[in-house]
């Protein structure tokens, strides 16, 4: 064969991935591989994951002579060792005025009165602990409740007899019940006064309120 067909092991270099070719004989060569590669022509990226140290649930992803960690959302950093501050990342992590408290691997919400749940989005059912009188209907509010009384009952807890039931106010007066003590309050029409709106008044004085 002519000299132009002579095989020169390192020309061109068979070594890949930055490997350096060294001729070891007439027809032989050796590749000196860069760190992270192996094989007769440095064709293989060595898997660095068997010896990984990804922390806190991180998943190893092989690199070149190193590895990286794919972190769960609560962690960051090359090895997932850095805690993510969810309170900075999500300013509205806690609803309804709740206060965000960062923790290793997560966060917590300190809820204001009346709210509960991981993000303070659940209105506490105050009716669960309410003492509305049987027969009345409890309505849940934020950090409170109210009782809807059946006819004949009054007071915040519907525990009082409704004094208006006996129509104590005269002359077309408006009867209201004091929610604290159950007593009636007469709002007298023009020209009348007194607890029951039974007394005449001078012209010019109108709409008197009387409590009983």
């Amino acid at each position: 064969a002519g000299s132009d067909s002579l095989y020169v092991p390192c020309a061109p270099s068979p070594c890949v991935n930055g490997g350096t070719c060294r001729q070891t004989g007439d027809f032989t060569f050796e590749c000196n591989c860069l760190p992270g590669f192996e094989g007769s022509t440095c064709e293989r990226n060595i898997d660095d994951c068997p010896n990984h140290r990804c922390q806190n649930g991180g998943v190893c992803v092989d690199g070149v002579n190193t590895y990286n960690c794919r972190c769960p959302p609560q962690w960051t950093g090359q090895f997932c060792t850095e805690d993510v501050d969810e309170c900075l990342l999500q300013p509205n992590a806690c609803q309804n005025g709740g206060t965000c408290a960062n923790r290793n691997g997560g966060y917590g919400c300190v809820c204001v009165n009346g709210w509960s749940g991981d993000d303070c989005s659940e209105n506490i059912d105050d009716c669960a602990f309410a003492s509305c009188t049987p027969g009345s209907t409890c309505i849940d509010r934020v950090a409170s409740f109210s009782c809807m009384c059946p006819e004949g009952k009054a007071g915040l807890l519907c525990h009082l007899d409704d004094a208006c039931i006996s129509n104590p106010c005269h002359k077309g007066a408006l009867c209201d019940t004091n929610p604290l003590n159950g007593q009636y309050i007469c709002t007298c029409p023009q020209g009348y006064k007194g607890a029951d709106c039974t007394e005449d008044v001078d012209e010019g004085n109108s709409h008197h309120h009387h409590h009983h």
Partner: antibody, heavy 120, light 107 residues
Framework: EVQLVESGGGLVQPGGSLKLSCAVS????????MEWIRQASGKGLEWIAA??????????VYSASVKDRFTISRDTSKSTLYLQMNSLKTEDTAVYYC???????????WGQGTLVTVSS | DIQMTQSPSSVSASVGDRVTITCQTS??????LAWYQQKPGKSPKLLIY???RLQDGVPSRFSGSGSGTDYTLTISSLQPEDFATYFC?????????FGGGTKVEIK
């Protein structure tokens, strides 16, 4: 409070076997990498085995000096880490520590150690 | 395996002295370095992790620095309870490897 307590050490003849235990408390055992480290008298620290956490399928790594002779395992129901040591050699004589890998690339909690003596 | 070269192997110092211990690794460990203190008959105690972060409960006179392959532990003002042996450890990849130790003795 995080606590690790090793037991099971003692005197054993070359070629013999021994099983070390490490009872842990004060943390969620399955969440952490656990390691065995040993220290020959007056010498430095030598890492010998690790078991990763549940998130990493409790995968295991050994040092070349104990591979195929020692086995690391854990029983999460008993919160106990084990080191089964077979074909013991005189050079395995050391104090054996179990330690918790605290998620910081560092060993943040250690047991008090248990002495293993391999001698005829 | 990653080789750890710790120096000096021993140092004599007095209370109040500043003590510096160095640790060199055979390859980049991306700040995955920890420092431990060990007293005779006791188990090691973590002082510094992540090359420079102080473990909870460790006095602030201990500090760590470095990156890549070169790391340092400094005790700014040596106290009587600091006389002990100190080890560095790389946590970048298995096998975990430790420095040979530095014994801090009373001068």
């Amino acid at each position: 409070e995080v606590q690790l307590v090793e037991s099971g050490g003692g005197l054993v003849q070359p070629g013999g076997s021994l099983k070390l235990s490490c009872a842990v408390s004060g943390f969620t055992f399955s969440d952490f990498y656990m390691e065995w480290i040993r220290q020959a008298s007056g010498k430095g620290l030598e890492w010998i085995a690790a078991q990763r956490n549940k998130a990493n399928d409790f995968s295991i790594v050994y040092s070349a000096s104990v591979k195929d002779r020692f086995t690391i395992s854990r029983d999460t129901s008993k919160s106990t880490l084990y080191l089964q040591m077979n074909s013991l050699k005189t050079e395995d004589t050391a104090v054996y520590y179990c330690s918790r890998d605290g998620g910081k690339l560092a060993l943040d909690a250690w047991g008090q150690g248990t002495l293993v003596t391999v001698s005829s | 395996d990653i080789q750890m070269t710790q120096s000096p192997s021993s140092v004599s110092a007095s209370v109040g002295d500043r003590v510096t211990i160095t640790c060199q690794t055979s390859e980049d460990i991306y700040s995955g370095l920890a420092w431990y203190q060990q007293k005779p008959g006791k188990s090691p105690k973590l002082l510094i992790y992540g090359a420079s972060r102080l473990q909870d409960g460790v006095p602030s006179r201990f500090s760590g620095s470095g990156s890549g392959t070169d790391y340092t532990l400094t005790i700014s003002s040596l106290q009587p309870e600091d006389f002990a042996t100190y080890f560095c450890q790389q946590g970048f990849k298995y096998p975990l490897t430790f420095g040979g130790g530095t014994k801090v003795e009373i001068k």
